[in-house]
Amino acid sequence: APTSSSTKKTQLQLEHLLLDLQMILNGINNYKNPKLTRMLTFKFYMPKKATELKHLQCLEEELKPLEEVLNLAQSKNFHLRPRDLISNINVIVLELKGSETTFMCEYADETATIVEFLNRWITFCQSIISTLT
């Protein structure tokens, strides 16, 4: 059974994951650049189901494409580069989903824009956090 300290750690990791996903989404939504239109043409795979930490496998598999799309903003001066954000997200995802069980991600038939994709995973984090508090 999970201890209160392990639950606290999971909650903190989910909060950090949530904050960085929101940071990326805000950056895209605020983007005062024609490249935003191009960013929205890229399609992302969405999970068929995302209700448990093991489903973060579906997010992990889309992190490389996410970084590539964010790199379109290369003309900007970054405080944090896309690779810094994606690297941190990857570390958190690996810790949260664990490596002891191999989970095959199932994707929905419909693909999504980067905004829809980020919103889906933001909702996932918020939902899991609410079950822990």
């Epitope: 994951l17 960085d20 940071m23 605020n30 900007k76 970054f78 405080h79 954000l85 941190n88």
Partner: nanobody
């Protein structure tokens, strides 16, 4: 409006250490980037290190392995632990608060704190 108050600068010998702190107050959003930039005389302002509220970090190549950035989200405070300081680290260090991961006209800057590395 966001106010930034820096502290911890000073004179230190080469090889020494300093810890800079910067507390943000005012209209703070939970999603933000805080960090440190520096400007040496006659040079352009450059990134030293930055950290998001989610813990993502970015370091200038010149400080990797010597400087560590950290933050306390509850206190809206960012810290820069500077070890193995070199004369070329001498500069005015500016605290920065941003609501996005890229530079924007809405970024806020502190007044700066002088760091001098000299024997």
């Amino acid at each position: 409006e966001v106010q930034l108050v820096e502290s911890g600068g000073g004179l230190v010998q080469p090889g020494g250490s300093l810890r800079l702190s910067c507390a943000a107050s005012g209209s703070i959003f939970s999603i933000n980037v805080m960090g440190w930039y520096r400007q040496a005389p006659g040079k352009q302002r450059e990134l030293v290190a930055a950290i998001s509220s989610g813990g993502s970090t970015n370091y200038a190549d010149s400080v990797k392995g010597r400087f560590t950035i950290s933050r306390d989200n509850a206190k809206n405070t960012v810290y820069l632990q500077m070890n193995s300081l070199k004369p070329e680290d001498t500069a005015v260090y500016y605290c920065m608060y941003a609501s996005s991961f890229y530079e924007d006209e809405t970024d806020y800057w502190g007044q700066g704190t002088q760091v001098t590395v000299s024997s």
